[in-house]
Interface confidence: medium
């Protein structure tokens, strides 16, 4: 039996992927729970595991198709419900009727690249990942950048409120090591989110020019 | 359209093991819960087995408990059935069958099918 409040939250990667997780404060035996989708107007349904990602909260993905097919729209409405095993029979512990593009959470940016760097600057590179159509140009990112002695919390986000997958970086200090993040997060929807942080990038500024004697 | 193709089948004595394999091409392995039939001549197509998406779970019909184990590899797109201590009654065509729902899986109805796998149990 499960006492307890319980939390079920859900985002769309705007393609093929709905991520799923619940949260459960009272104590679950070790019983088999699902995440269950059934759209109000796709032929489909699916499923996932809940598999556990701490002592009281489990997570999956519903993978709806090929990772960029586009399996959703902006009118769709699909039923998402937690159930779990008591015995030969199934209990509804969550339910909601969720609208993917108001809860969308995108794919990290990848393929971040130094497009070229100087003593005091670099160009920097990335592309966004199994994105939908519909956004178009939608889409603003954040970025920051790792200086040496500092934690990623401690780094200024800086901002594109455009769909740039670039950006220059200025005042570097010379022959220093960097590493570069950034994030991407569409403009639409009430309850979209930022998608996680793209995996570090590492780059190392110019030596500054030797002084000549004079 | 999904595409399941299975092996593994073959003539085998009383109380002996078979591993049936079922490899699955055309879409995204990991969508599918993952399920074994059979069909004994005469009889209706019944459920053995299944697995979940991640593997995790697993379940059996009671004839079978105890005796065969599913289980899938999803870096192999492979489900497979193996079945130790096999009895006569066992004796039947082995159908791998597949479902994004994976309560629907223990119908016959919706489910995604190979072309079955002749299993003979001589006593």
């Known amino acids: 039996a499960v006492n307890g409040t319980s939390q079920f939250t859900c985002f769309y990667n705007s393609r093929a992927n709905i991520s799923c997780v619940w949260s459960q404060d009272g104590a679950l035996q070790d019983t088999s729970c699902q995440v269950h989708a059934w759209p109000d107007r796709r032929r489909w349904n699916q499923t996932c595991e809940l598999l556990p990602v701490s002592q009281a909260s489990w997570a999956c993905n519903l993978i709806l198709g090929a990772p960029d097919s586009q399996k959703l729209t902006t009118v769709d409405i699909v039923t998402l419900r937690v159930l779990c095993r008591e015995g030969v029979r199934w209990r509804v512990m969550a339910i909601q009727d969720f609208k993917p593009f108001e809860n969308l959470r995108l794919m990290a940016p990848i393929s971040l690249q130094v497009v070229h760097v100087e003593t005091h600057r670099c160009n920097i590179s990335w592309e966004i990942s199994q994105a939908s159509h519909y956004f178009e140009r939608h889409l603003e990112f954040e970025a920051r950048t790792l200086s040496p002695g500092h934690t990623w919390e401690e780094a200024p986000l800086l901002t594109l409120k455009q769909k740039q997958e670039w950006i220059c970086l200025e005042t570097l200090t010379p022959d220093t090591q960097y590493e570069f993040q950034v994030r991407v997060k569409p403009l639409q929807g009430e309850f979209t989110t930022w998608s996680p942080w793209s995996q570090p990038l590492a780059f190392r500024t110019k030596p500054a020019a030797l002084g000549k004697d004079t | 359209q999904v595409q399941l193709v299975e092996s593994g089948g073959g003539l085998v004595q009383a109380g002996g093991s078979l591993r049936l394999s079922c490899v699955v091409s055309?879409?995204?392995?990991?969508?599918?819960?993952m399920a074994w039939f059979r069909q004994a001549p005469g009889k209706e197509r019944e459920f053995v087995a299944a697995?979940?998406?991640?593997?995790?779970?697993?379940e059996y019909v009671d004839s079978v408990k105890g005796r065969f184990t599913v289980s899938r590899d999803n870096a192999k797109n492979t489900v497979y059935l193996q079945m130790n201590n096999l009895k006569p009654e066992d004796t039947a065509v082995y159908y791998c069958?597949?479902?994004?729902?994976?309560?629907?899986?223990?119908?016959?109805?919706?489910?995604?099918w190979g072309q079955g796998t002749q299993v003979t149990v001589s006593s």
């Open positions: 055309g879409d995204v392995f990991v969508r599918y819960t």
């Open positions: 697995v979940t998406d991640s593997g995790r779970t697993t």
């Open positions: 069958a597949a479902n994004t729902d994976y309560f629907q899986i223990r119908s016959v109805d919706n489910n995604a």
